[in-house]
């Protein structure tokens, strides 16, 4: 779970090992702050829980791509 050290900076210290279906994920944000020990992705789930994940993992990248496509407005 993400940890807010000095708000508003939120950092991840551990990543989930478990692969999670993109259908459980609602959105994500990248953590790139130099105040954090590592780069991370924080997924927000459909039930509003937050999960720290490793942006180097393929399933994480695939999930971000899927969520990006899901939020793009269709061209008319």
């Amino acid at each position: 779970q993400p940890d807010a050290i000095n708000a508003p900076v939120t950092c991840c210290y551990n990543f989930t090992n478990r692969k999670i279906s993109v259908q459980r994920l609602a959105s994500y944000r990248r953590i790139t702050s130099s105040k954090c020990p590592k780069e991370a992705v924080i997924f927000k789930t459909i039930v509003a829980k937050e999960i720290c994940a490793d942006p180097k993992q393929k399933w994480v990248q695939d999930s971000m791509d899927h969520l990006d496509k899901q939020t793009q407005t269709p061209k008319t």
């Epitope: 779970q1 989930t16 090992n17 478990r18 692969k19 999670i20 279906s21 993109v22 259908q23 459980r24 609602a26 789930t45 459909i46 039930v47 829980k49 999960i51 399933w59 899901q70």
Partner: antibody, heavy 119, light 113 residues
Framework: QVQLVQSGAEVKKPGASVKVSCKVS????????MHWVRQAPGNGLEWMGG????????IYAQRFQGRVVMTEDPSTDTAYMELSSLRSEDTAVYYC????????????WGQGTLVTVSS | DIVMTQSPDSLAMSLGERATINCKSS????????????LVWYQQKPGQPPKLLIY???IRESGVPDRFSSSGSETDFTLTISSLQAEDVAVYYC?????????FGQGTKVEIK
């Protein structure tokens, strides 16, 4: 392809504990979210608990809280479910179950372990 | 907790007949942002673990015959076997996976008349 192989049937006396194992192959246990579901004779399916990546920890159904412990041994890719203070109503088939990408449903099941509680 | 209620508890049909099982959830299992219903159906035969039949409320698992179909949204779902076969004799369960604790319906036993 995930495969789950469970330990054999057990007979226990009321008040005792039982520990059921579930060996994973074809996948690394720590990549999966392993859960346990039980089924009493002639009854339906009842979720007992399991690892929930959304909480980052093992969660348990309220009715088993304090009586069940689910653990993992990553070195052997084996999950365990230990139920204590057994009573006759705990006589059931216990299943471990999971899926490759955690969604909340189960597409891989162990073969089941019958636990009989009898004096 | 989301309570799942199936009806009927059991049904007996002739071979080739259409069998319908209903599943009702105490609250919606639809996530509107992706328009997905977090509901699955399992089939369980005696002495075997449950087998996944349908997920996301309407998608058949690979290898499941097309006589099995499911429909519904939010709180009301239906599993249909269009032409009952002898090998379909089993207990069928719905399960919601919108939020924990993950909950199952009580099951519907399907028999041949």
């Amino acid at each position: 392809q995930v495969q789950l192989v469970q330990s054999g049937a057990e007979v226990k006396k009321p008040g005792a504990s039982v520990k059921v194992s579930c060996k994973v192959s074809g996948y690394t246990l720590t990549e999966l979210s392993m859960h346990w579901v039980r089924q009493a004779p002639g009854n339906g399916l009842e979720w007992m608990g399991g690892f929930d990546p959304e909480d980052g920890e093992t969660i348990y159904a309220q009715r088993f809280q304090g009586r069940v412990v689910m653990t993992e041994d990553p070195s052997t890719d084996t999950a365990y479910m230990e139920l204590s203070s057994l009573r006759s109503e705990d006589t059931a088939v216990y299943y471990c179950a999971t899926n490759e990408f955690w969604s909340g449903y189960f597409d891989y099941w162990g073969q089941g372990t019958l636990v009989t509680v009898s004096s | 907790d989301i309570v799942m209620t199936q009806s009927p508890d059991s049904l007996a049909m002739s071979l080739g007949e259409r069998a319908t099982i209903n599943c009702k959830s105490s609250q919606s299992v639809l996530y509107s942002s992706n328009n997905k219903n977090y509901l699955v159906w399992y089939q369980q035969k005696p002495g075997q673990p449950p087998k996944l039949l349908i997920y996301w409320a309407s998608i058949r698992e690979s290898g499941v015959p097309d006589r099995f179909s499911s429909s519904g949204s939010e709180t009301d779902f239906t599993l249909t076997i269009s032409s009952l076969q002898a090998e379909d004799v089993a207990v069928y369960y719905c399960q919601q996976y919108f939020s924990s604790p993950w909950t199952f319906g009580q099951g519907t036993k399907v028999e041949i008349k």
